[in-house]
Amino acid sequence: LRHVVYWNSSNPRLLRGDAVVELGLNDYLDIVCPHYEGPGPPEGPETFALYMVDWPGYESCQAEGPRAYKRWVCSLPFGHVQFSEKIQRFTPFSLGFEFLPGETYYYISVPTPESSGQCLRLQVSVCCKERKSESAHPVGSPGES
């Protein structure tokens, strides 16, 4: 399953900070960056960096410290940009983010200095069961996989 989130300040739930998405293992979270066909809003286009943070970072909407991970940058408002996060237990050699069932993960965006964007927030709740078994074993494995 794929869950698409249009990440821009026209999304009231992201703006209020009460957006919660529940995903299962092996699902995908698709983040769609702001996109403008024409010149964009008079105050200028939204550009920002998205971070995975801990609860204090989510509450204060601050991406600082060792538990704030920069995930993606929405910096091309006149192009179609989308990022995907696979909700997985393993990534090969742990070279990717690994999600634990029953845990909640917090995403925020921090506007770039020249941007008109605001702080947007999303909670991702990882459910306990796999929606589908892609294989009897994860591909790869060292912690990974």
Epitope: Y69, K70, R71, W72, V73, K86, R89, F90, T91, P92, F93, S94, L95, G96, F97, E98, L100, P101, S135, H137, P138, V139, G140, S141, P142, G143, E144, S145
Partner: antibody, heavy 124, light 112 residues
């Protein structure tokens, strides 16, 4: 700093079982997979399996499915591997290994940490 | 299981000279996520192994830049621009793309 402490050696009789330990310190034990690797004298490396201390989910190499059982004790941050029905083929050094994730910009980097290994000798 | 074949088995090199080790896999190591999960390990005498290179060509923290990893698909190479005494030991390639992860048989590097 991250440390994985393993006993130096175990001497066991053929047909018996042995439970090897790997005590973790210096990081959050329940956040990262713990792997076990076998190295026979003068030979290469074999991956046995992995366990996640968060909920004890395990994945085994089929070649070791009936030989090894992986468990953890979260309270003492210790991973265990029990080897059963031991034969001379099981005489080897066994390593525990974990990968501690950090992040560089948008990229996850995982540094490997190895225990010193436990030398298991199966002999009557 | 994916078979990893390393050559040569033993490599005798003079200090300061270049050297290279080859690793071939029985299947492509390109993962469906677009990455190639091929590592190189070094096991110095009497020590535990330690990873030197990950994702084919990325040097681990603290690894000197005289080491270079390259390759794609099924063919991979570890090169030393100039050998130093501390480089002696056994080198292993290690794949994590396919389950279960597997290792090459090792290449023993000795000083001539």
């Amino acid at each position: 700093q991250v440390q994985l402490q393993q006993p130096g050696a175990e001497l066991v009789r053929p047909g018996a079982s042995v439970k090897l330990s790997c005590k973790a310190s210096g990081y959050t034990f329940t956040r990262d997979w713990m792997h076990w690797i076998k190295q026979r004298p003068g030979q290469g490396l074999d991956w046995i399996g992995t366990i996640h201390p968060y909920d004890s989910e395990t994945h085994y190499n089929q070649n070791f499915k009936d030989k090894a059982t992986l468990t953890v004790d979260k309270s003492s941050s210790t991973a265990y591997m029990q080897l059963s029905s031991l034969t001379s083929e099981d005489s080897a050094v066994y390593y525990c290994v974990t990968f501690i994730k950090t992040m560089v910009d948008t990229y996850y980097y995982a540094m490997d940490y190895w225990g010193q290994g436990t030398s298991v000798t199966v002999s009557s | 299981d994916v078979v990893m074949t390393q050559t040569p088995l033993t490599l005798s090199v003079t200090i300061g000279q270049p050297a290279s080790i080859s690793c071939k896999s029985s299947q492509s190591l390109l993962h469906s996520d677009g990455k190639t999960y091929l590592n190189w390990l070094l096991q110095r005498p009497g020590q535990s192994p330690k990873r030197l290179i990950y994702l084919v060509s990325n040097l681990d923290s603290g690894v000197p830049d005289r080491f270079t990893g390259s390759g794609s698909g099924t063919d991979f190479t570890l090169k030393f621009s100039r050998l130093e005494a501390e480089d002696l030991g056994v080198y292993y390639c290690w794949q994590g793309t396919h389950f279960p992860q597997t290792f090459g048989g090792g290449t023993k590097l000795e000083i001539k």
